[in-house]
């Protein structure tokens, strides 16, 4: 997977009036990395691993960048015509990537009230607009404003791209990111499914990087995809990931089944625990980490694009 830096900024308006402040989150290699603290008006690292990336360096540059971007986005929202009454949001997602062959990619996406209406591939300078008439109108609005604004020239976008890549490279200088390998903890549980059947669940947690193979085997042979259920690979809030795989088997055949895990060149197999069947109250939880933004967005039913 490529290394990536992803900026996620949102500004809000109420009854046509753009609100002060903004919401911002930065992901590094798919992990929550920075968040803009609106109370302290500062960029704050998300968790210990994020703090370790810069060591004892300050987060002044990040604070300055996010503040500038937030201000730009507020101005853009102010230029969107026909804002109906009530709450509205403008969200900008900017991503830059460095691939294994050292090639780079950069893109930018705008969402209004959670709906994508404008995308740009920075390298090719190509803008894309979805088919819907609402998206077309919004895109025309924003593009006209961006053209008017002398700052928003081609040069500006390339500079933004270059800044993003520069920051990403700066973070990658930290061995915490580049050579980070956290092996998963693997745990197999069983629960009663129906008469004569049990569900066996294999959970892998606290691993990094994200790529993992987790599958059930019968007699050493991988079960077909349609007989297994997979959970998403999700951040667990500690700079690592979690996932699970489950299958249904006949009670008494447990010895034939093992969970096979492969991660970062290492592998392991895990048998089904024998003994009394555990009736688990809840399955593997699907945590969607919105880091405090959740409340605002849930309350207003605005979609937060991860």
């Amino acid at each position: 997977e490529p290394h990536s830096l992803r900026y996620n900024l949102t500004v809000l308006s109420w009854d046509g009036s753009v609100q002060s402040g903004f919401l911002a989150e930065v992901h590094l290699d798919g992990q929550p990395f920075l968040r803009y603290d609106r109370q302290k008006c500062r960029a704050k690292p998300q968790g210990q691993w994020a703090e370790d990336v810069l060591g004892n360096k300050t987060w002044d540059r990040e604070t300055r960048d996010l503040t500038g971007n937030g201000k730009d986005l507020r101005m853009t929202l102010a230029h969107i015509k026909d804002q109906k009454e009530g709450l509205h949001s403008l969200q900008e997602i900017r991503v830059c990537e460095i691939h294994e062959d050292n090639s780079t990619r950069s893109s930018q996406h705008f969402y209004y009230d959670g709906e994508l209406f404008l995308s740009q591939n920075v390298e090719t300078e190509e803008w894309t607009v979805p088919q819907s008439s609402r998206a077309q109108t919004l895109a025309m609005n924003v593009r006209n404003f961006l053209k008017e604004d002398a700052m928003k020239t081609k040069t500006h976008y390339h500079a933004m791209h270059a800044d993003c890549l520069q920051e990403l490279r700066r973070y990658l200088e930290s061995s915490v990111v580049l050579r980070r390998r956290v092996p998963p903890m693997v745990n197999v549980t069983r629960s009663e499914a129906s008469e004569g059947n049990i569900t066996v669940t294999c959970r892998a947690s606290s691993f990094y990087p994200r790529n993992i193979t987790l599958t059930w085997r019968q007699d050493g042979v991988s079960l077909s995809h349609d007989t297994q259920q997979w959970g998403d690979v999700l951040p667990d809030g500690n700079g690592t990931y979690q996932t699970w795989v489950a299958t249904r088997i006949c009670q008494g055949e447990e010895q034939r089944f093992t969970c096979y895990m492969e991660h970062s060149g290492n592998h392991s197999t895990h048998p089904v625990p024998s003994g009394k069947v555990l009736v688990l109250q809840s399955h593997w939880q699907h945590h969607h980490h919105h880091h405090g933004l959740n409340d605002i967005f849930e309350a207003q039913k605005i979609e937060w694009h991860e």
Epitope: R217, D219, G220, V221, S222, Q255, R256, T258, Y260, H267, S268, T269, H270, P271
Partner: antibody
Amino acid sequence: EVQLQQSGPELVKPGASVKVSCKASGYAFTKYNIYWVKQSHGKSLEWIGYIDPYNGGTVQNQKFKGKATLTVDKSSSTAYMHLNSLTSEDSAVYYCATTDGYSLFTYWGQGTLVTVSS
Amino acid sequence: DIQMTQTTSSLSASLGDRVTISCRASQDIGNYLNWYQQKPDGTVKLLIYYTSRLHSGVPSRFSGSGSGTDYSLTISNLEQEDIATYFCQQGNTLPFTFGSGTKLEIK
């Protein structure tokens, strides 16, 4: 290339025991099970059991419980089958096999002939 | 235990012939049926797994079919190197069991 190299032929006396080895190469040994199969002279094949080299867990055919013991040595990527209290019924060619994770008995060793005779 | 029956113990065919070897299970094995080739020197190779999936490196003249209890292996264009004994094996239920084998000879 996956290879399973088995130990040479054995001539043993009734009541004695024998240890057949199977050295794996060309893949990560602890990734895949090792299976053992018996073929008596001019007869069909019989599955003895298998071992997971990662954790040493075994699953055996009831018929061979008490007769065959399966072990591995991870450091040398070698699987072993120990046969005890040998009788003429145990005279056979013994094969080890492994999987690619998609099919049983995907790759086979060349076989080890065990002859039990006084 | 599930019995695997290969009714034809030996079969004579000419080079270029289409040959079919059959195998019957004593109960439904849900397509968990594999075919192996054993050469006269004792070398064993997997040909087909899960009824019809061709193992990598196996010539496409080999094919498998069947369901439930009845399965077959077909060699579409018999070659000299196909002279061997063919075994079916079920992987559905423990213990795994093999058919008694079908020895293929050239006329």
